[in-house]
């Protein structure tokens, strides 16, 4: 029925009240149930009405609003602190302790995160987004600057049917169609050659403990790795020669180094530098991310930040040490 | 096949020296940590020291501090257990063991030696 | 420190029996805990860890579940081979801590 410009959907009743006419529904069985799209936000239950918006939400703390949308601090909760002189003492020392592998203490310092402090450092979220990693969707964490919510929020539970030989298969040239989805890495863009690129701005530079030739044998394994984890596809940069950017790493001087090398007396011929692992220049490549989805990097800062994230998560396959997002990459760093 | 064999073991007096040896392949040495593990005879096991050797970071029991050293040589694929001011409780089984995390100490050891005997007397 | 104690410290079972270890830590170790068993004369073996993920190589009957400090391993059907002594160790803080054992003997 409908009464004046006021449109009523079907089983509502028009009512002529004093501040105009209103919808109202005389039994909300035969009316749409304003539920029936789940508008109740992280965990709230969901109430039929016999009003516009045909539902209330029973919110669970800390949220509230009319669809549990916002998130309210409870007053009473002092801002965390890492208190503890052991957590003191241990961070930076290039060994994750999980005891401090924490917010408060900066993920052991860093040591925990790639040597990255705050991978959350720009979201802006109401909610602690890096303790919402919780296999559930939190969406005032579903934002770029957010991490994607750690991907929570798109089916991250989906997995690569064929996985073995989709990794046995990833960037070998030739187009296997049952490879050809995100969560198998798209081939590693083997079914799009003929698709024009679209890299995100920056560069991904990564210290990993393996020699060049060994990252450069395994590199298909290593990017799609890495690529599974950002749900897009990455390669290794090429310099001005059109050579890999895949370097000899010596290894930082972290105090720790500094004081193992007083101790450790050097024997006559010893090298004194030693390769530690490579250090390797990233870009992501969106061509296909794009197509299948809105959660896609446009630049390599928040990438960098999610992969500290799976650091500090322990789901890191690789033995990687620490991650930077480059805007403009010198033609080789050391 | 990841292997790792402890050699350096023997008999010392109290008060002696002794530098134990763990041999480590078919991984990247530097990528995980390693722990020195001891088992007094008939006792149960009892975490001594543990190093990352690609940074060097070294953590110690109570029980070993000041008197216990581990080091670790990447470029012979080595870790050390340098013992001095040895004691009668030091006698054990000592085992070495890797992390399997990385650079995490908070992972479990999934490899083990087959262990060196240590005895201390008089 | 954290303490981890095991119970019971021996127990004799036959082959077919099901099998329950209990451990528990002196303060939360969340889940990174870790199971081994040791067989005389030999170094001990790396069953369980994260206190419920079997290690590669691990057989089915053997599982582990808790968190925080209340810790179970099962063997839900001993096989003659399952004889040995069991260990839990925390690995959450250094000083890393094991529990004192529990020795598995045939009745």
């Known amino acids: 029925s409908s009464c004046g410009q006021v449109k009523c959907r079907k089983g509502e009743q028009c009512v002529h009240t004093a501040s105009g006419p209103r919808c109202f529904c005389p039994s909300p069985r035969d009316c749409e149930s304003g539920c029936a799209s789940s508008p109740c936000q992280h965990g709230g239950s969901c109430h039929p009405q016999r009003q516009p918006p045909y539902y209330s939400c029973q919110c669970a703390p800390p949220f509230s609003g009319s669809r549990c949308e916002l998130y309210t601090a409870p007053p009473s909760t002092p801002p965390a602190t890492c208190l503890s002189q052991y957590c003191a003492d241990k961070a930076r020392d290039g060994v994750c302790d999980e005891a401090c592998n924490s917010h408060a203490c900066q993920w052991d310092g860093g040591d925990c995160s790639l040597t990255m402090e705050n991978p959350w450092a720009n979201c802006s979220s109401p909610l602690p987004c890096w303790d919402y990693i919780n296999n559930q969707c939190d969406e005032l964490c579903n934002t770029v600057e957010c991490l994607f919510d750690n991907f929570e929020c798109q089916g991250n539970s989906k997995t690569c049917k064929y996985d073995k030989y989709c990794a046995d298969h990833f960037k070998d040239n030739h187009c296997d169609q049952g490879c050809n989805s995100e969560e198998c890495g798209w081939d590693g863009l083997d079914c799009a050659a003929d698709q024009p690129e679209n890299l995100a701005e920056g560069t991904l530079v990564i210290v990993v403990l393996m020699p060049p030739e060994q990252l450069l044998q395994d590199a298909r394994s290593f990017l799609r790795a890495l690529g599974t984890l950002l749900h897009t596809n990455l390669r290794i940069k090429r310099d001005s020669q059109g050579e890999l950017m895949v370097y000899p790493y010596y290894g930082e001087k972290s105090a720790a180094m500094k004081k193992q090398r007083m101790t450790r007396r050097s024997l006559p011929g010893e090298q004194e530098q030693e390769v530690a692992g490579s250090k390797v220049f990233l870009e992501i490549d969106n061509r296909q991310c794009v197509q299948d989805s809105d959660h896609c990097f446009k630049n390599t800062d928040a990438a960098a930040a999610l992969l500290a994230s799976h650091a500090i998560q322990g789901t890191l396959s690789y033995p990687l040490v620490s991650v930077v997002s480059e805007s403009l990459t010198p033609e080789r760093t050391q | 096949e990841v292997q790792l064999v402890e050699s350096g073991g023997g008999l010392v007096q109290p008060g002696g020296s002794l530098r134990l040896s763990c041999a480590a392949s078919g991984y990247t040495f530097s990528s995980y940590g390693m722990s020195w593990v001891r088992q007094a005879p008939g006792k149960g096991l009892e975490w001594v020291s543990y190093?990352?050797?690609?940074?060097?970071?070294?953590y110690y029991a109570d029980s070993v501090k000041g008197r216990f050293t581990i080091s670790a040589d990447t470029s012979k694929n080595t870790a050390y257990l340098q013992m001095n001011s040895l004691r009668a409780e030091d006698t054990a089984v000592y085992y070495c063991a890797r992390h399997s995390g990385y650079y995490r100490i908070s992972s479990a050891m999934d490899v083990w030696g087959q262990g060196t005997l240590v005895t201390v007397s008089a | 420190d954290i303490q981890m104690t095991q119970s019971p410290s021996s127990l004799s079972a036959s082959v077919g029996d099901r099998v329950t270890i209990t451990c528990r830590a002196s303060q939360s170790n969340r889940r990174f805990l870790a199971w081994y068993q040791q067989k005389p004369g030999k170094a001990p073996k790396l069953l369980i860890y994260g206190a419920s993920s079997r290690a590669s190589g691990v057989p089915s009957r053997f599982s582990g579940s808790g968190s925080g400090t209340d810790f179970t391993l099962t063997i839900s059907s001993l096989q003659p081979e399952d004889f040995a002594t069991y260990y839990c160790?925390?690995?959450?803080?250094?000083?890393?801590?094991f529990g004192q054992g529990t020795k598995v003997e045939i009745k």
């Open positions: 190093i990352y050797p690609y940074s060097g970071a070294t």
């Open positions: 160790q925390q690995y959450y803080i250094s000083p890393l801590t």
